[in-house]
């Protein structure tokens, strides 16, 4: 559904967003997971969402950082393939991926929602709805 | 249908400020952002930032990033850009843009902003 | 930032000849890739996105390909409404729109 192809790239959006920041962010590492395995997308998703990415207190971009941090873990309305993904018992808990620095962290975030953008519109049998 | 109406010409003085709207009719205002999108005279399309229409979140070009402010009256349907500080290389043709799936499906019929002393 | 490079930036071609214009990423931009058509004193219109994917009510004589840094825009016969400028723009990164390339008749 062209709603949730637009939060995705929304989502991109936002991260690329912060990544400009990345030096203003916490520099803890965060599970950030990786090659996930067919029907755990939304599963992955949710646990990037989950993760305590946050602003170092430091500078003027604080406001601009945390707003954005807000906004990427907004939940949007749910298809039916995320509810039944986030209660499968198979889907790698969030604490068993590869924790990582703020930088991969984003970079694999986006190309999770790359990823699954992709496998939207190759399920698309037909040409654009709305673009 | 959807559409995207944008405000009239404006001519404005070296470091002043301009504000052009932009109202959307023909869809749910807050299910789409919107792009704002500029074309200086005979040159190409230059991309200045975008603004959730539902929370004002916005994120704008590096190169425009402290002279522009996009915003948005859910009231009325219109987003706003607003450039300040501006110069003659600010003269231009400044669209909206729908942010659609995955391009800008629809376009506002540009605003010619003139800056001249 | 991710550039992109337009070619070329004018051609001249008469009713019914095969079109090509081709843009060029800075880096890799996987498919993220979207063409629009601008006629003088108007708004652009899309045209293809992601690549390959033909926007509603677009005519079948335009195709789009290409992967990676280099794409391609093909109109497969020229029609006399088809004489414009054409701007090719990623969405890999933010947004950035290549140079544009003006389609004039012969």
């Known amino acids: 559904q062209d709603r949730h192809m637009i939060r995705m790239r929304q989502l991109i959006d936002i991260v690329d967003q912060l990544k400009n920041y990345v030096n203003d962010l916490d520099p803890e590492f965060l599970p950030a997971p990786e090659d996930v395995e067919t029907n755990c997308e939304w599963s992955a998703i949710s646990c990037f969402q989950k993760a305590q990415l946050k602003s170092a207190n430091t500078g003027n971009n604080e406001r601009i950082i945390n707003l954005s941090i807000k906004k990427l873990k907004r939940k949007s309305p749910s298809t039916g393939a995320e509810r039944r993904q986030k209660h499968r018992l198979t889907c790698p808990s969030c604490d068993s991926y590869e924790k990582k620095p703020p930088k991969e962290f984003l970079e694999r975030f986006k190309s999770l929602l790359q990823k699954m953008i992709h496998q939207h519109l190759s399920s698309r049998t037909h040409g654009s709805e709305d673009s | 249908q959807v559409q995207l109406v944008q405000s009239g010409a404006e001519v404005k003085k070296p470091g002043a400020s301009v504000k052009v709207s932009c109202k959307a009719s023909?869809?749910?205002?807050?299910?789409?952002?919107m792009h704002w999108v500029r074309q200086a005279p005979g040159q190409g399309l230059e991309w200045m930032g975008l603004?959730?229409?539902?929370?004002?979140?916005?994120i704008y070009n590096q190169k425009f990033k402290g002279r522009v402010t996009m915003t948005r009256d859910t009231s009325t349907s219109t987003v706003y850009m607003e450039l300040s500080s501006l110069r003659s290389e600010d003269t231009a043709v400044y669209y909206c843009?729908?942010?659609?799936?995955?391009?800008?499906?629809?376009w506002g019929q540009g605003t010619l902003v003139t800056v001249s002393s | 930032d991710i550039q992109m490079t337009q070619s070329p930036s004018s051609l001249s071609a008469s009713v019914g000849d095969r079109v090509t214009i081709t843009c060029r990423a800075s880096?890799?931009?996987?498919?993220?890739l979207n063409w629009y058509q601008q006629k003088p004193g108007k708004a652009p219109k899309l045209l293809i996105y992601y690549t390959s994917r033909l926007h509603s009510g677009v005519p079948s004589r335009f195709s789009g390909s290409g992967s990676g840094t280099d794409f391609t825009l093909t109109i497969s016969s020229l029609q006399p409404e088809d004489f414009a400028t054409y701007y090719c723009?990623?969405?890999?990164?933010?947004?950035?729109f290549g140079g544009g390339t003006k389609v004039e008749i012969k």
């Open positions: 023909g869809y749910t205002f807050t299910d789409y952002w």
């Open positions: 603004i959730d229409t539902s929370e004002s979140y916005t």
């Open positions: 880096q890799d931009i996987s498919n993220y």
């Open positions: 843009a729908r942010y659609g799936p995955l391009a800008m499906d629809y």
């Open positions: 723009q990623q969405f890999h990164t933010l947004r950035t």
